[in-house]
Amino acid sequence: CDLPQTHSLGHRRTMMLLAQMRRISLFSCLKDRHDFRFPQEEFDGNQFQKAEAISVLHEVIQQTFNLFSTKDSSVAWDERLLDKLYTELYQQLNDLEACVMQEVWVGGTPLMNEDSILAVRKYFQRITLYLTEKKYSPCAWEVVRAEIMRSFSSSRNLQERLRRKE
């Protein structure tokens, strides 16, 4: 499955939107910094079958979509930017969904590295618990926004490697 060029553009637009969403300086939130232990090894990608890599990317975007579509999120961020973010993420999910399904049905379901999916899920669990503990404060959301940008940057590297494999 070839990820369309629009997927890379959408990824770039998502990064831009996440940057635009910033409401306060991260420097004013230094006391709230947190290590979410991003599962970098799941994005280094050399050990991946293509189908696995696409599933991992899908999970990251799906969890990001769910994170930013909570009631608490809609209070924290500019509604107009959030709507744009949903649109971009939704389009990326559609692109990846088509790819995952294609990889699944070409010669049966490939072995899925379920531990990679679980590692991504656990990473977002840490983010969710952090927000809960911090009572969804503006600084907590800012720390999370910056963290999601970082995770998207890493997932972009994995996407680029996928494109080179094609």
Epitope: L93, T109, L118, Q125
Partner: antibody, heavy 119, light 108 residues
Framework: QVQLQQPGAELVKPGASVKLSCKAS????????MHWVKQRPGQGLEWIGE????????IYNENFKSKATLTVDKSSITAFMQLSSLTSEDSAVYFC????????????WGQGTLVTVSA | QIVLTQSPAIMSASPGEKVTLTCSAG???????LYWYQQKPGSSPKLWIY???NLASGVPARFSGSGSGTSYSLTISSMEAEDAASYFC?????????FGSGTKLEIK
């Protein structure tokens, strides 16, 4: 509000198959993995597996790989679990439960379908 | 697979009594992924405590959870009639996800 609707009961013959349904409402069906859990009368809970309704990928408990097949129909926002080659050991209540994170993990369950395997 | 052993299997407590249910894991479980569910006869399980110590929405403050590694517990500071139910611990720290066999809590 989030709801998962399951039929109350299914009576099936030994050796036959049954397809259980779980109809979702109140949220975006494709955004959350759907899980299935087995409970035999008066006993504990066993995790069977999960499916991502967005693309249909599945993850199974090895103990159920040859017994259960998970599928979804996005058009009817329904998850399915087919159980094959049924024996009395398969007589149980089967629940669907929605994934999520933090306080949303298995926060929503169907009412369960009682499967009775009897000649 | 991580086996979760709950004890006691059945216990009864008087109203006002302090109750502690335990859940022992066969291998270490990260506390973020240890949950408790309450189930009453004829009903589906209800999320009760998430990530070891956080009460789910609507759960009375007399409930608390604690633990780490292989040892976890659910405590009721003062037993009430409505607390009579089965309680299951659950882990999603590793596949396959598992549940404890449950503790049935009865009121005296």
């Amino acid at each position: 509000q989030v709801q998962l609707q399951q039929p109350g009961a299914e009576l099936v013959k030994p050796g036959a198959s049954v397809k259980l349904s779980c109809k979702a409402s109140g949220y975006t069906f494709t955004n959350y993995w759907m899980h299935w859990v087995k409970q035999r009368p008066g006993q504990g809970l066993e995790w069977i597996g999960e499916i991502n309704p967005s693309h249909g990928r599945t993850i199974y408990n090895e103990n159920f790989k040859s017994k259960a097949t998970l599928t979804v129909d996005k058009s009817s926002i329904t998850a399915f679990m087919q159980l094959s080659s049924l024996t009395s050991e398969d007589s149980a209540v089967y629940f669907c439960a929605r994934g999520g994170l933090g306080p949303a993990w298995f926060a929503y369950w169907g009412q369960g379908t009682l499967v009775t395997v009897s000649a | 697979q991580i086996v979760l052993t709950q004890s006691p299997a059945i216990m009864s407590a008087s109203p006002g009594e302090k109750v502690t249910l335990t859940c022992s894991a066969g291998s270490s479980v990260d506390s973020s992924y240890l949950y408790w569910y309450q189930q009453k006869p004829g009903s589906s399980p209800k999320l009760w405590i998430y990530s070891t110590s956080n009460l789910a929405s609507g759960v009375p403050a007399r409930f608390s959870g604690s633990g780490s590694g292989t040892s976890y517990s659910l405590t009721i500071s003062s037993m009430e009639a409505e607390d009579a139910a089965s309680y299951f611990c659950h882990q999603w720290s590793s596949y396959p996800f598992t549940f404890g066999s449950g503790t049935k809590l009865e009121i005296k």
